[in-house]
Interface confidence: medium
């Protein structure tokens, strides 16, 4: 469970306008539990197919987890008067497969959004920015939790999932104030090149349990506030000099690298040298080689340059296609 949110039909302003009355400040939607004292509304595991229209105006924490929302339309949480207090919205595990542009518009205080565990076949580029302008009004979001939002293979669009998520993160430069971004367990093969440049306020970035093979084209240079970078459980083979220098240059960062299949050949020499002197990597004594076979389970910190060789290229007569 986490903080949650409220939404409406695809004609959000009509809901309360129909009766020409704003919702009563203390009413509680059917199938929900409400606490005005805690400013919390919970509509959890109720198989809701849309966001209740009659959410109380006091709601600060809204939980809509474990439902069957399917689509979050534009203005899903827009109300008249607006839900001005809503700060934390949790939509995790609600079978969302489509989040449309402007879905979170008219939520001026929304600081935390959790869309985890939804198989998002479509995430609009304007889901968080709310408009297709090249520079949008800043989003109030500070924490964005997008763990395990990758759809099953048969539901994927033709475009790359990484690209779709990246487009939503950078659109309109709306997320310049984002402090925390969790993108764990999304089968990411790569991190699109310009994403991090558009998120300069990031303090916590979780990319664990993906399939990242390389960080060669990723720049961390402008993430001067970054405090924690989680890269555990990926497919990283080596970190090259450019990446090492950028990480070392970040004043507050802690990097987590456990459980990657490090390849301990001649290309690993710079990383091993760096590991021995850096204070940036947490638990660096636990990092071990996965390849080549002769190096398996060797501790990276215990290696020296003599251990890190590359097999010479086979002569043409011995090469196989």
């Amino acid at each position: 469970t986490s903080s949650a949110s409220s939404s409406s039909s695809s004609a959000p302003f009509l809901a309360s306008a129909a009766s020409a009355q704003p919702p009563l400040p203390d009413q509680c939607p059917a199938l929900c539990e409400c606490s005005e004292a805690a400013r919390t509304v919970k509509c959890v595991n109720r198989n809701l197919t849309e966001v209740p229209t009659d959410l109380p105006l006091y709601v600060r924490n809204l939980f809509l987890t474990g439902n069957q929302l399917a689509v979050l339309p534009a203005g899903a949480f827009a109300r008249r008067p607006p839900l001005a207090e809503l700060a934390a919205l949790n939509l995790s595990g609600s079978r969302l497969d489509e989040v449309r542009g402007g879905a979170f518009e008219h939520l001026p205080s929304l600081r935390q959004l959790d869309l985890s565990h939804n198989p998002l076949a479509y995430l609009s580029p304007f889901a968080f920015s709310g408009s297709n302008a090249s520079i949008s009004a800043p989003s109030p979001l500070v924490e964005l939790i997008l763990n395990h939002i990758v759809p099953p293979d048969d539901k994927r669009q033709n475009r790359s999932f990484e690209g779709m998520v990246a487009a939503a993160l950078v659109a309109g430069r709306a997320l310049q104030g984002l402090h925390l971004l969790e993108l764990a367990s999304n089968h990411f093969l790569y991190l699109p090149r310009d994403v991090l440049a558009q998120l300069p306020s990031l303090r916590y970035l979780d990319l664990s349990n993906n399939s990242l093979v390389s960080l060669t084209y990723v720049s961390f240079r402008n993430l001067t506030h970054l405090e924690s970078l989680h890269l555990e459980d990926n497919a990283l083979k080596v970190l090259h000099n450019g990446t090492l220098a950028e990480l070392q240059g970040l004043p507050h960062v802690r990097v987590f690298l456990d459980n990657n299949p490090w390849v301990c050949d001649c290309h690993m020499a710079d990383m091993v040298t760096w590991l021995k002197q850096t204070g940036v990597v947490q638990g660096k004594d636990r990092l071990t080689c996965a390849f080549p076979e002769k190096m398996r389970n060797r501790v990276l910190l215990e290696l020296n340059s003599a251990d890190l060789d590359c097999d010479p290229i086979l002569p043409p007569s011995l090469q196989t296609s």
């Epitope: 934390a88 959790d114 939790i145 969790e182 303090r203 916590y204 664990s208 459980d233």
Partner: antibody, heavy 121, light 107 residues
């Protein structure tokens, strides 16, 4: 309904070993990080160890590092804690707990009932 | 490691009282703090997560606040069933440490 059921506790001599198990049901086990927390008699809670959903990443309190090993079998929906070189100060009730959330937005939302480990000669 | 210090270590209050327990971190932990309640012989129970979010099923008389290093758990109107030990826990650090606990007794 989420359920966590610990087993494997008992009396063991100093220097001995014990393996605790935690059988999970009612949720998709592999999607959640899990943890062990212990409580010595009359004392407070002490975080012992945690493991990621895949089992690939493990974390240990300094007091148990090198002696305890956390692991999981996602096909059996079971969490384990292998405890070696046990000491008198490891005597405690050991709880398994489920983590909800990410690395930071993380909290233990379900706990088992605990299993008592007594280390004594 | 990040140290968590709770105060007071114990307190006694009457039914209907407003009770406040504080938790201080040895370094900034943003809002990554949880509160648990434990009754004798029972497993801990999650009350508040992420500093201020109330866990499902927890009475609304419980609330949490704070950010950075200083956090507060408040019980707005103490009930007899609130007699228990309360623990804070940080999840910012690599190791998710608990405070030493605050034992709350009903007068």
């Amino acid at each position: 309904e989420v359920q966590l059921l610990e087993s494997g506790g008992g009396l063991v001599q100093p220097g001995g070993s014990l393996r605790l198990s935690c059988a999970a049901s009612g949720f998709t086990f592999s999607s959640y990080a899990m943890s062990w927390v212990r409580q010595a008699p009359g004392k407070g809670l002490e975080w012992v160890s945690a493991i990621s959903g895949s089992g690939g990443s493990t974390y240990y309190a300094d007091s148990v590092k090198g002696r305890f090993t956390i692991s999981r079998d996602n096909s059996k929906n079971t969490l384990y804690l292998q405890m070696n070189s046990l000491r008198a100060e490891d005597t405690a009730v050991y709880y398994c707990a489920r983590y909800y959330g990410g690395y930071y937005s993380a909290w233990m939302d379900y706990w088992g009932q605990g299993t008592l480990v007594t280390v004594s000669s | 490691d990040i140290q968590m210090t709770q105060s007071p270590s114990s307190l006694s209050a009457s039914v209907g009282d407003r009770v406040t327990i504080t938790c201080r971190a040895s370094q900034s932990i943003s809002s990554f703090l949880n509160w648990y309640q434990q009754k004798p012989g029972k497993a801990p129970k999650l009350l508040i997560y992420a500093a201020s979010s109330l866990q499902s099923g927890v009475p609304s008389r419980f609330s949490g606040s704070g950010s950075g290093t200083d956090f507060t758990l408040t019980i707005s109107s103490l009930q007899p069933e609130d007699s228990a030990t309360y623990y804070c826990q940080q999840t910012y650090g690599y190791l998710h440490t608990f405070g030493q606990g605050t034992k709350l007794e009903i007068k």
